[in-house]
């Protein structure tokens, strides 16, 4: 018996047909049994093309030129399959090859109708004759499948893939896929705490999936220009209070533990349209609500001599998220949007709730993704369903003590703003937002018998924002901008301009209120230089909850050209602080507003890529950042 394979190496194209030839001669007069076996490569040829073949194999093949590291090895170290066998005129395919166009023809030739990637390897033609057992009964052919397809040829007609072996092609494909995922991963992780990870955790930063689903929905609703119907996971918490001339909106307070503060990371430069939210977590011993309540009480009782009396007498200051930088409190004024939100009950008026909050009952720490179970959401929803009269009892708190006007808040900030300044504090700092610094001596509240606020927030932060002491507050109208037709005119936000006296422009708000009376016909007002995305969305099935974040820049008639300089401003901002402006509401009557936290990344890349938003796209609000 003599078996010969004419071609020792056969090269064929992927998805194309091929024939592996095998000839035999025998002295037997009995019909021979022909079998074709497939043996995979001992070592991946792709590894060789990518320079990954083992040094041992290279050394052995150099020492023994007859030995091929790809073809010569024990069958136990590679895949071995029966492709097909033929006895008489009956051809039987191996299990793995069933359903494929494969047959044995012309004595012992193996025809393969369509080559697949896995077909590369060594094929053995084995002839068995019952009465001729002498001689060579098998021979092999190496089949190499090349990676050119008709599709690829059509797409890349000039790309010569014919010379590219299978493993090179596979290598390039795998490399391409790997690079694609790397790029996706980088982009994803650049914006990890943003809305993209509200639903899927980013593998690079698994603990940073901090924004609840409701935020995203609120953002979409705000963009669309109508109050969102809120459902889903509630935001962390809020302090309801009456904004300056604010429209009705529901407040939200939750007796929920909050995760401990994460170490802030730097944020500098870039566009101002990127949101950066603090990820606030709870201290087991203390409820952050106490801090908020304490500060609000403090503000309500602050130096009456400097207060503006009059039309703002029944308002209290708005409180925003606790920002754990420098153990200082920041305050920012936010733009408002001329649109009404529906009323909803105010938790703050519920004495049962407050007894719970002040009781310091704070439970265990939660992870960064604030998870509230169904029972929590239900109880919260029921607590929201208050009668209007009960809700309005909140006014008692306001009317008893005159509220703080904007000038007074400025003065309040100025009195505490004499602490360390940044070395690079220049006129640009004025545009970096108004941030009040609270002296540590005042940070020991009555509610913290077991520790100071310093302890609560953590000491030793090196980053300090610029002070506001030397600057006054003014309103200045912004240049007119195109806005969506449904947007009501926006007041020019409070600007910090050097050298201005601490005067308050009553006429401005009067005009705003007049316009409010006829919002449909009102002319389109200007807005901030840096409009923003919606900050955050709060609790389940409640009315409209918005997180209000400090704006990046407040410019008094600053030219568009100055935008480039704003990159420097962000240095002055605390990490994760909200950079974006949210649009708020202006309303004729006093009402209560909810407050929530939003969590956002400080990604540089994201900031640079994000296109400037249209002014007036989202709600903003004047808030005191504590």
């Amino acid at each position: 018996l003599q078996v010969t394979v004419p071609d020792k190496k056969k090269v064929a194209m992927l998805f194309q047909p091929t024939v592996l030839r095998c000839h035999f001669s025998t002295s037997s007069h009995q019909p021979a049994v022909v079998q074709w076996k497939f043996k995979s490569y001992c070592q991946d040829r792709m590894g060789e093309s990518l320079g990954m073949s083992s040094p041992r194999a290279q050394a052995l093949s150099k020492r023994n030129l007859e030995w091929d590291p790809y073809l010569d090895c024990l069958d136990s170290r590679r895949t071995v399959r029966v492709v097909a066998s033929k006895q008489g005129s009956t051809v039987t395919l191996g299990d793995f090859y069933r359903g494929r166009e494969i047959t044995i023809v012309h004595d012992a030739d193996l025809q393969i109708g369509k080559l697949m990637w896995g077909d590369s390897g060594l094929y053995y033609c084995i002839i068995t004759t019952p009465d001729d057992l002498e001689g060579k009964n098998e021979d092999s052919v190496e089949l190499l499948v090349l990676g050119r397809t008709g599709l690829l040829a059509d797409l890349l007609p000039s790309f010569a893939v014919e010379i590219m072996p299978e493993w090179v092609f596979v290598g390039l494909v795998i490399l391409g896929i790997f690079l694609f995922f790397v790029l996706v991963g980088i982009c994803w992780c650049q914006c990890c705490p943003h809305s993209c990870c509200c639903y899927v955790r980013c593998p690079c930063c698994p603990d940073s999936c901090c924004c609840p689903q409701a935020l995203y929905e609120a953002g979409k609703a705000a963009k669309a220009g109508y109050p969102p119907s809120v459902s889903g996971v509630p935001g962390p918490y809020s302090i309801p209070s009456v904004p300056l001339g604010g429209a009705p909106s529901s407040g939200m307070l939750m007796d929920k533990p909050h995760p401990p503060p994460l170490a802030p990371s730097d944020s500098t430069g870039g566009s101002h349209s990127v949101r950066k939210g603090y990820r606030i977590q709870a201290d087991k011993e203390r409820d952050s609500m106490k801090v908020l309540y304490y500060v609000e009480k403090e503000l309500a009782q602050f130096d009456p001599a400097r207060r503006m009396r009059g039309r703002y007498n029944n308002t209290i200051s708005e409180l925003s998220s606790l920002h754990d930088d420098d153990s200082n409190f920041r305050q920012s004024y936010h733009q408002m949007r001329n649109k009404q939100f529906p009323m909803s009950g105010d938790l703050e008026s519920n004495p049962d709730y407050w007894s719970g909050v002040m009781g310091g009952n704070s439970g265990t720490n939660r992870g960064p993704a604030l998870e509230y179970n169904k029972e929590d959401r239900e109880s919260f929803r029921h607590s929201q369903q208050r009668s209007k009269s009960e809700m309005l009892s909140r006014k008692n708190f306001a009317t008893g003590v005159p509220a703080v006007s904007m000038d007074e808040l400025a003065a309040f900030a100025d009195s505490y703003g004499q602490r360390s300044r940044r070395a690079n504090g220049n006129s640009h700092e004025a545009r970096a937002g108004s941030r009040f610094e609270r002296s540590e001596s005042r940070a020991h509240g009555a509610f913290y018998q077991d520790g100071s606020l310093d302890e609560y927030y953590g000491r030793g932060r090196s980053r300090e924002p610029p002070g506001d002491g030397e600057r006054g507050w003014t309103y200045s109208p912004a240049p007119a901008r195109r806005r969506p037709p449904e947007d009501a005119p926006l007041p020019r936000l409070v600007s910090r301009t050097p050298g201005t006296a601490p005067k308050y422009d009553h006429s401005y708000l009067s005009s705003v209120l007049e316009r409010q009376a006829r919002p449909e016909s009102s002319s389109r007002g200007g807005s901030l230089e840096t409009p923003s995305k919606l900050g955050a969305q709060l609790g389940p099935r409640s009315a409209s909850y918005y997180a209000w974040s400090p704006p990046t820049t407040y410019k008094a008639g600053a030219s568009e050209g100055e935008d480039e300089d704003d990159a420097a401003d962000e240095d002055a901002l605390p990490p994760y602080s909200e950079l974006e402006l949210s649009r708020g509401e202006l309303s004729r009557g006093p009402s209560y507003r909810g407050r929530d936290l939003s969590f956002h990344s400080n990604s540089e890349k994201r900031r640079k890529k994000e296109p400037a938003k249209k002014p007036g796209d989202f709600p903003t609000r004047m808030s005191l950042v504590v």
Epitope: E101, T103, G113
Partner: antibody, heavy 121, light 107 residues
Framework: EVQLVESGGGVVQPGGSLRLSCAAS????????MSWVRQAPGKGLEWVSG????????QYADSVKGRFTVSRDNSKNTLYLQMKSLRAEDTALYYC??????????????WGQGTMVTVSS | DIQLTQSPSSLSASVGDRVTITCQAS??????LNWYQQKPGKAPELLIY???TLESGVPPRFSASGSGTDFTLTINSLQPEDIGRYYC?????????FGGGTKLEIK
């Protein structure tokens, strides 16, 4: 009796299209590769296109690539050749041929009588 | 693609003569070569496959040999019914290809 019968030929203008059919009988059609072979008047045989037994693999002569499409319907025992963008040089007698053995076109043991395609303006 | 060149392109022989037709391949086709006979006005018929194996029903006066690149078809005793065209065809490397043909006539 094993036989192949072609149809669908005719006269067509340059740039036109035609669809040829080949009805097979007398053998297990789905077990064999099939081919179209043409013969221009007074010329030799030219293999045009082939298709594997299940239709998973097709092959074409360079002269017809991109213009002709071979297909088969094993349930109807029929082979097809869709011809588009016909040229004068495509004028020929088109034969349908059964492969001698196996899933790929190699040796043709059964031939049809052919159908004439004339491309003329 | 493998090109096949047949020679002569035409020949005329007497009945009973021994006739030889050659086919040369542009590259090695091993033994994967067929011979066809096409009688006037008819479809081609397979005479020999695998370079030397006679197809069933073909008279034994026909024989063929060769391997690699050079192949020959021999008709030992020419008969009147043998007139027509003879083609070689390779199937070693797809796509299959035909030779130009040899026209055989009877003197």
């Amino acid at each position: 009796e094993v036989q192949l019968v072609e149809s669908g030929g005719g006269v067509v203008q340059p740039g036109g299209s035609l669809r040829l059919s080949c009805a097979a009988s007398g053998f297990t059609f789905s077990s064999y590769a099939m081919s179209w072979v043409r013969q221009a008047p007074g010329k030799g045989l030219e293999w045009v296109s082939g298709i594997s037994s299940s239709g998973g693999s097709t092959q074409y002569a360079d002269s017809v690539k991109g213009r002709f499409t071979v297909s088969r319907d094993n349930s109807k025992n029929t082979l097809y050749l869709q011809m588009k963008s016909l040229r004068a040089e495509d004028t020929a007698l088109y034969y349908c041929a059964k492969d001698f053995v196996g899933v790929l076109p190699d040796a043709f043991d059964i031939w049809g009588q052919g159908t004439m395609v004339t491309v003329s303006s | 693609d493998i090109q096949l060149t047949q020679s002569p392109s035409s020949l005329s022989a007497s009945v009973g003569d021994r006739v030889t037709i050659t086919c040369q391949a542009s590259q090695d086709t091993n033994k994967y070569l067929n011979w066809y006979q096409q009688k006037p006005g008819k479809a081609p018929e397979l005479l020999i496959y695998g370079a030397s194996t006679l197809e069933s029903g073909v008279p034994p006066r026909f024989s063929a040999s060769g391997s690699g690149t050079d192949f020959t078809l021999t008709i030992n005793s020419l008969q009147p019914e043998d007139i027509g065209r003879y083609y070689c065809q390779q199937y070693h490397i797809p796509p299959p290809s035909f030779g130009g043909g040899t026209k055989l006539e009877i003197k």
